[in-house]
Interface confidence: low
């Protein structure tokens, strides 16, 4: 008599998570009499997936009616597939007996489950860095299968090449994770820049998934300082300006010192943005020249974003300004008038 064949025609089947998987199996003969069972895996640790005679298998249904006479199709459908269902499934013929004896196994069908990667999450450096420094951004996405995946980095539309990417685990798994680090060299113009991490995978039917990070969270643009004297006013007051330009973020404290003594402290707030995302701030100090015997050393001291203070000094030459007759010559500071230019 012809030897019984158990035919599993597909070596592999790939299914999206949440879909149903059909695992085909036919036998070439009705004899000998005995049941068919489905297992995941081989050997002593194999897992029973479906047994027509007994057991409760709520997610598994036969494709054709196994009770009808002369049925030789023992294909099954597994519903609501998850990555945990991945593995090799064997259709096994038993000879009826007490107990039933395993007679022949099909070649097996490998079920791979396609699971979408999670939305990429991009994280930047913990502390800000200045222009010309390199900062690292990390992108992570999890829970995808199969392992093949493409990840690309872009900064303002340009693909980045200084990238290191790892997919874990290295061996077989029900799902995988990707972690990629991109190194970006900052420029002073990067306040409005953005990095994008783009993940493409077999499960994504349209555009890749994207995660973004703004370089504004990673960059510090230190200010330029300039102290200038305006022409002296008729009332013997000299207008001194401290221009603080092109800085980011806005967190900035400005202190005026007269001959080393604190005259006034101001905090920047609600400044308008420049086109490149940086800020400018101008502070004015009125110095009453007639209140001073000697030259006045004015210092504009700027503390930006918690960094060490930056100073710019300017000497107002008192000798160059003749004092008014009978004016009070005691060293008193009347320079309390100020204006902020926004």
């Amino acid at each position: 008599e012809e030897e019984l064949q158990v035919i599993q025609p597909e070596k592999s089947v790939s299914v999206a998570a949440g879909d149903s998987a059909t695992l085909n199996c036919t036998v070439s003969s009705l004899i000998p009499v005995g049941p068919i069972q489905w297992f995941r895996g081989a050997g002593p640790g194999r897992e029973l997936i479906y047994n027509l005679k007994e057991g409760h298998f709520p997610r598994v249904t036969p494709v054709s009616d196994p009770t009808k006479r002369n049925n030789m199709d023992f294909s099954i459908r597994i519903s609501n597939i998850t990555p945990a269902d991945a593995g090799t499934y064997y259709c096994v013929k038993f000879r009826k007996g007490s107990p039933d004896v395993e007679l022949k196994s099909g070649a097996g069908t490998e079920l791979s489950v396609r699971a979408k990667p999670s939305a990429p999450v991009v994280s930047g450096p913990a502390v800000r860095a200045t222009a010309e420094h390199t900062v690292s951004f990390t992108c992570e996405s999890h829970g995808f299968s199969p392992r093949d995946i493409t990840l690309k980095w872009f900064k303002n539309g340009n693909e980045l090449s200084d990238v290191q990417t790892n997919v874990d685990p290295a061996g077989k798994s029900v799902s995988y994770s990707i972690r990629s680090t991109a190194r970006v060299v900052l420029t002073r113009r990067d306040v409005h820049s953005q990095v994008i991490c783009e993940v493409a995978h077999v499960t994504l039917q349209g555009d890749p998934l994207r995660g973004t990070a703004n370089l504004s969270e990673a960059i510090r643009v230190p200010p330029f300082l300039e102290v200038t004297q305006q022409s002296m006013r008729a009332d013997n007051q000299v207008n001194v300006t401290c221009q603080v330009t092109k800085f980011y973020p806005q967190r900035l404290q400005l202190t005026w010192l007269e001959n080393g003594n604190v005259s006034r402290t101001e905090m920047a707030s609600a400044l308008p943005e420049n086109k490149d995302g940086t800020y400018n701030w101008t502070s004015w100090l009125l110095v009453n020249v007639s209140a001073h015997r000697d030259d006045v050393k004015l210092t504009c001291q700027v503390e930006h974003d918690g960094q060490p203070a930056v100073n710019k000094s300017f000497s107002v030459k008192v000798s160059a300004h003749p004092k008014e007759q009978g004016s009070n010559t005691a060293a008193e500071n009347t320079g309390t008038n100020e204006r902020n230019i926004y």
Epitope: T150, T203, Q205, D207, P208
Partner: antibody, heavy 123, light 107 residues
Framework: QIQLVQSGPELRKPGETVKISCKAS????????MNWVKQAPGKVLKWMGF????????TYADDFKGRFAFSLETSASTAYLQINNLKNEDTATYFC????????????????WGQGTSLTVSS | DIVMTQSQKFMSTSIGDRVSVTCKAS??????LAWYQQKPGQSPKALIF???YRYIGVPDRFTGSGSGTDFTLTITNVQSEDLAEYFC?????????FGAGTKLELK
């Protein structure tokens, strides 16, 4: 580096069959769809369709249904374009071109191209 | 089918100039638009995808812009190696379609 290398120029008579190959290297072949594009002399580039290298399923543009067949030899990272019952108007350069990493996505932008295979059909 | 119109078949330029190649889609394609450069006897070379993203290795003198139906490829400081034909292509809707091309030549 990533390369798509196509087979050499072909001269055929009307009614014959031709099979053009495109061998990919430098990347994971089954991660990117392979498209075919026709460039006839003096005519606009014409997208013929693509084959999903992950599933082997071909998709043809309407003008290329019937006499045209895309196939794969995955183990050799090679895609094929076969044209049956050749006509004079099949005279053109045929390019294979890879779709960016969109896998199952229908088409996309083409980041790498083969050097092209010139086909001349003449009696 | 979506028709991609490149109204200028030829454009004359000088080395160092700035030139803009335009492309119009017959219907909205979002930003699913790519630009290619082709030199005689060569295969097309990918320049831009998603309307404005440069491929790695493409000089930053090439800039893509636009969305919806109107797109522009701008080349600033044109170099001699930029003298070639430029094609746009939409990949929003099947069938994927190309523009007829714009040839950049010296004045």
């Amino acid at each position: 580096q990533i390369q798509l290398v196509q087979s050499g120029p072909e001269l055929r008579k009307p009614g014959e069959t031709v099979k053009i190959s495109c061998k990919a290297s430098g990347y994971s072949f089954t991660n990117y769809a392979m498209n075919w594009v026709k460039q006839a002399p003096g005519k606009v580039l014409k997208w013929m369709g693509f084959i999903n290298t992950y599933t082997g399923e071909p998709t043809y543009a309407d003008d290329f249904k019937g006499r045209f067949a895309f196939s794969l030899e995955t183990s050799a990272s090679t895609a094929y374009l076969q044209i049956n019952n050749l006509k004079n108007e099949d005279t053109a350069t045929y390019f294979c071109t890879r779709t960016r990493g969109y896998y199952d996505f229908d088409g996309g932008a083409f980041d790498y191209w083969g050097q092209g295979t010139s086909l001349t059909v003449s009696s | 089918d979506i028709v991609m119109t490149q109204s200028q078949k030829f454009m004359s330029t000088s080395i160092g100039d700035r030139v803009s190649v335009t492309c119009k889609a017959s219907q909205n394609v979002g930003t699913h638009l790519a630009w290619y450069q082709q030199k005689p006897g060569q295969s097309p070379k990918a320049l831009i995808f998603s309307a404005s993203y440069r491929y790695i290795g493409v000089p930053d003198r090439f800039t893509g812009s636009g969305s919806g139906t109107d797109f522009t490829l701008t080349i600033t400081n044109v170099q001699s190696e930029d003298l070639a034909e430029y094609f746009c292509q939409q990949y929003n809707t099947y069938p994927l379609t190309f523009g007829a091309g714009t040839k950049l030549e010296l004045k």
